[in-house]
């Protein structure tokens, strides 16, 4: 008998090379075979459970950056007046959540902020829990 | 043929809103359907393996806080004279281990320390390993 | 019918008690039943996917330390002029990658650096993905 295989784990790595002041960061998924999807500049959560979240990047100017998942809830990450980020966190997310950036710069310029090495990774930690597609 | 489902991963999120000087933090599990249990103010480990551990909180006064798992072993986390914590770690835990807090304040008052956003998450990283219930 | 069990997750914990200047750290796997292997002082990657990586240690002198996985690629971790490390990261690794240390000290002596509590943990986060043995 063939031993059971794992169904694919919900995970995604998105990249971002620029962020817009008072908006967010433009995210793209470099791989075609990710198990999670990007829609309207947000990562769509289909499965309930804990997620491991890794966020990295170097910014062309000082900014304040937050990563949200649900209207009316506090951010997953919130960094004030930084020029880089290299953080890891764990959070409980659920079906219908959407993970997206909010960015504010402290300059009078309205130019985009350039990002080097901008990377956001989400990895589901509770396979076997509720999912809806 | 239906693809195999994952059995639930051992994981838990506990909250704590107060800590007692020279004792620990009073932990409660807000969800009924956690796959790990709280007993005598400790999280009970049933499965051997690596665990992802996330610890967060803001404290009403300066304290020293350690998170233990086994008598005679060093702490999983140890923070000296802090007013907040936001840490992630990885540790190998085993059946019969119990994860619990120890707290010391540096004030002459014996009042409880109030905690805002106090959260401890454990997520088993080695399903398929030894478990005993 | 017996519910399906998880096949073992690819994971390993290696220890290191000394590092050689302009070389690396001598790693040993204390457990016989690890699901990943050490070869030529490197951890061999057999499975594609995200890995949770934990790195800890206290050094007998100041050093610069990098953790690499592939020739021509940037390091997984890079620490400059430190006496200790306690870091967690997430990275995408693939079959044929090898995880290894590079160390530089800033003294004119060529003695080994002694390490206390030196530990490197890798845990695969995408079971069900491609593996080759």
């Amino acid at each position: 008998q063939v031993p059971p295989q794992y169904p694919p784990i919900q995970s995604i790595r998105v990249q971002f090379t620029r962020c817009e002041n008072e908006k967010g960061c433009i995210i793209t998924s470099p791989s075609k075979d990710e198990t999670m999807k990007v829609q309207d500049n947000s990562i769509i959560i289909n499965c309930d459970g804990f997620y491991l979240i890794s966020l990295k990047g170097y910014f062309s100017e000082e900014l304040s950056l937050s990563l949200y998942y649900r209207k009316g809830r506090g951010p997953l990450f919130s960094l004030s007046k930084v020029t880089s980020v290299d953080s890891i966190g764990v959070a409980y997310l659920a079906f219908k959540d959407k993970v997206y950036f909010n960015v504010t710069t402290h300059s009078t310029s309205y130019k985009d902020i350039q990002v080097n090495g901008g990377e956001l990774i989400l990895i589901h930690q509770n396979p076997g829990g509720f999912c809806a597609y | 043929q239906v693809p195999p489902q994952y059995p639930p991963i051992q994981s838990i999120r506990v909250q704590f809103t107060r800590c007692e000087n020279e004792k620990g933090c009073i932990i409660t599990s807000p969800s009924k359907d956690e796959t790990m249990k709280v007993q005598d103010n400790s999280i009970i480990i049933n499965c051997d393996g690596f665990y992802l551990i996330s610890l967060k909180g803001y404290f009403s006064e300066e304290l020293s806080l350690s998170l233990y798992y086994r008598k005679g072993r060093g702490p999983l986390f140890s923070l000296s004279k802090v007013t907040s914590v936001d840490s992630i770690g990885v540790a190998y835990l085993a059946f019969k281990d119990k994860v619990y807090f120890n707290v010391t304040t540096h004030s002459t008052s014996y009042k409880d320390i109030q905690v805002n956003g106090g959260e401890l998450i454990l997520i088993h990283q080695n399903p398929g390993g030894f478990c005993a219930y | 019918q017996v519910p399906p069990q998880y096949p073992p997750i690819q994971s390993i914990r290696v220890q290191f008690t000394r590092c050689e200047n302009e070389k690396g750290c001598i790693i040993t796997s204390p457990s016989k039943d690890e699901t990943m292997k050490v070869q030529d002082n490197s951890i061999i990657i057999n499975c594609d996917g995200f890995y949770l990586i934990s790195l800890k240690g206290y050094f007998s002198e100041e050093l610069s330390l990098s953790l690499y996985y592939r020739k021509g690629r940037g390091p997984l971790f890079s620490l400059s002029k430190v006496t200790s490390v306690d870091s967690i990261g997430v990275a995408y690794l693939a079959f044929k990658d090898k995880v290894y240390f590079n160390v530089t000290t800033h003294s004119t002596s060529y003695k080994d650096i002694q390490v206390n509590g030196g530990e490197l943990i890798l845990i695969h986060q995408n079971p069900g993905g491609f593996c080759a043995y």
Epitope: - | G74, S78 | Y58, F59, S60, E61, T83, S109, Q114
Partner: antibody
Framework: ELHLVESGGDLVKPAGSLRLSCVAS????????MSWVRQSPGKGLQFVAG????????QYRDDVKGRFTISRDNTEKTLYLQMNNLRVEDTAMYYC?????????????WGQGTLVTVSS | SYGLTQPPSVNVTLRETAHITCGGD??????VQWIQQIPGQAPVVIIY???NRPTGIPERFSGANSGNTATLTISGALAEDEADYYC?????????FGGGTHLTVL
């Protein structure tokens, strides 16, 4: 500039207690192992106790184990030595010493010392 | 535990070269520090990691370490160098000292 300033030395009776302190400045205190070393009058240097950079790991010479406790407060940049059940033979100048790393025992800077006298 | 052996005293003529030895089992595999203590003063590290001089230590002080012997050399000793000299190594997280050598400058 690097400084280590010890205090707390005094004249004390046998079986008494003292707490020595060492305030550090001029370097990242939390990154380095620290030690206490003593020197009895007219004698050589003697390692007393050491503590690694974040305080998890401590070492003691055999004849002070169970009587002396080394500790540190990285936020206050202060090293401590709690000395209980003091003996006449503990009389010495006590020096606070910085290590080259977070662990290891290789010294690179000494304080000026604080004098402990145990006498009835 | 690990032991370090030093000669109790060494004499040197003014502006001549003095050698102070420190013996220990395979001491060459360990880092050696040399500590100077002028009478009535606190100890000062004059050589660390076998042969490195801290800022402000004169060039006449040098160190070497191999096999079972570490050596402190004072090239052109001056009257102000008259002091006690201790070798020191780290050993399994603790620290070990030699018994000390008193240098007399004649």
């Amino acid at each position: 500039e690097l400084h280590l300033v010890e205090s707390g030395g005094d004249l004390v009776k046998p079986a008494g207690s003292l707490r020595l302190s060492c305030v550090a400045s001029g370097f990242t205190f939390s990154s380095f192992r620290m030690s206490w070393v003593r020197q009895s009058p007219g004698k050589g240097l003697q390692f007393v106790a050491g503590i690694n950079s974040d305080g998890y790991n401590t070492q003691y010479r055999d004849d002070v184990k169970g009587r002396f406790t080394i500790s540190r407060d990285n936020t206050e940049k202060t090293l401590y030595l709690q000395m209980n059940n003091l003996r006449v033979e503990d009389t010495a100048m006590y020096y606070c010493v910085k290590d080259q790393g977070s662990w290891g025992g290789n010294f690179d800077f000494w304080g000026q010392g604080t004098l402990v006298t145990v006498s009835s | 535990s690990y032991g370090l052996t030093q000669p109790p005293s060494v004499n040197v003529t003014l502006r001549e070269t003095a050698h102070i030895t420190c013996g220990g089992d395979s001491i060459g595999s360990k880092y050696v520090q040399w500590i100077q203590q002028i009478p009535g003063q606190a100890p000062v590290v004059i050589i660390y990691k076998d042969r490195n001089r801290p800022t402000g230590i004169p060039e006449r002080f040098s160190g070497a370490n191999s096999g079972n012997t570490a050596t402190l050399t004072i090239s052109g000793a001056l009257a102000e160098d008259e002091a006690d000299y201790y070798c020191q190594v780290g050993d399994s997280g603790t620290s070990v000292f030699g018994g000390g050598t008193h240098l007399t400058v004649l």
